[in-house]
Interface confidence: low
């Protein structure tokens, strides 16, 4: 088992909104849960955008999940990752 590296980034979307993207890479096996949570509760599927779980050429995998949030509310959102029985949460950088 190889645990993922998780990286959260933010980018400007429309005025007053930002897109936050959570990327997991370098993990094995491919089974992973990656999702955005607001106040500790998973966002609905229709408010998140997922990348496919894809091989990265090193025998490991990579994927991402993104959502759009209101600027100023970043502290309410975390990226939740679960892989091979281990889990972690990752905040949005300020």
């Amino acid at each position: 088992t190889v645990p993922p590296m998780v990286n959260v980034t933010r980018s400007e979307a429309s005025e007053g909104n930002i897109t936050v993207t959570c990327r997991a890479s370098g993990f094995y096996p491919w089974n992973i849960t990656l999702s955005w949570r607001q106040d500790g509760v998973s966002l609905s599927h229709d408010t998140q955008q997922w990348g496919d779980v894809l091989p990265d050429g090193n025998g490991t995998y990579q994927t991402w999940v993104a959502t759009r949030i209101c600027q100023g509310e970043e502290q309410r959102f975390t990226c939740y990752m679960e892989h091979s029985g281990n889990h972690s949460t990752h905040p949005v950088p300020s």
């Epitope: 993207t21 990327r23 491919w30 955008q49 894809l54 091989p55 991402w64």
Partner: antibody, heavy 118, light 108 residues
Framework: EVQLVQSGAEVKKPGASVKVSCKAS????????IYWVRQAPGQGLEWIGY????????IYNQQFKDRVTITADTSTSTAYLELSSLRSEDTAVYYC???????????WGQGTLVTVSS | EIVLTQSPATLSLSPGERATLSCSAS???????LHWYQQKPGQAPRLLIY???NLASGIPARFSGSGSGTDFTLTISSLEPEDFAVYYC?????????FGQGTKVEIK
């Protein structure tokens, strides 16, 4: 309805370059990768590479890495495949395809025939 | 690179017969990353079965898939005239993504 519409057939001389377009509609363009695959006459399918339009990541089949450029324009929901230094063995139908789950190819363009002939 | 070998190269059968197509991988593949496509002359391939055994949208139930590890099978329980085509397996578990060389199902 998901649709991938490719540009028309091309005839090129050896050593030239060709650029094939693939316009996507019926879904959020940045939600799925665009794969490129080619099929030589009477032959099987060969994966060239893919682009993830959302984060701009591009991964190539090493066999094509030196001669292929894959790009995407999210403003027009269009992906492009450019192949340079063409040779006769590049004569093939080039397909774009949308990525489905677990790296499959769930929707396909109609194909673009590229003929390389002197 | 994972090499997929399909057998037989050609399968000659009559409508109503059962077709069994094999796909053998040079290395073990997670069943979640093995897919099947159908291609008719002059047309683009279309996704038939994904993740070894799941029917793609609009694909009739006479198609089924099974297998694990290195050996996978596509079965057509009773061939219809429109099923005569070339079938490809594909793996998405490691780069480069690869296809089998195809099995042509032709009318006997």
């Amino acid at each position: 309805e998901v649709q991938l519409v490719q540009s028309g057939a091309e005839v090129k001389k050896p050593g030239a370059s060709v650029k094939v377009s693939c316009k996507a509609s019926g879904y959020a363009f940045t939600s799925n990768n665009i794969y490129w695959v080619r099929q030589a006459p009477g032959q099987g399918l060969e994966w060239i590479g893919y682009i993830d339009p959302y984060i701009g990541r591009i991964i190539y089949n090493q066999q094509f890495k030196d001669r292929v450029t894959i790009t995407a324009d999210t403003s027009t929901s269009t992906a492009y495949l450019e192949l340079s230094s063409l040779r006769s063995e590049d004569t093939a139908v080039y397909y774009c395809s949308r990525s489905g789950e677990r790296s499959n190819f769930d929707y396909w363009g109609q194909g673009t025939l590229v003929t390389v002939s002197s | 690179e994972i090499v997929l070998t399909q057998s037989p190269a050609t399968l000659s059968l009559s409508p109503g017969e059962r077709a069994t197509l094999s796909c053998s991988a040079s290395s073990s593949i997670s069943s979640n990353y093995l897919h099947w496509y159908q291609q008719k002359p002059g047309q683009a391939p279309r996704l038939l079965i994904y993740r070894t055994s799941n029917l793609a949208s609009g694909i009739p139930a006479r198609f089924s898939g099974s297998g694990s590890g290195t050996d996978f099978t596509l079965t057509i329980s009773s061939l219809e005239p429109e099923d005569f085509a070339v079938y490809y397996c594909q793996q998405g578990g490691s780069l480069p993504l690869t296809f089998g060389q195809g099995t042509k199902v032709e009318i006997k």
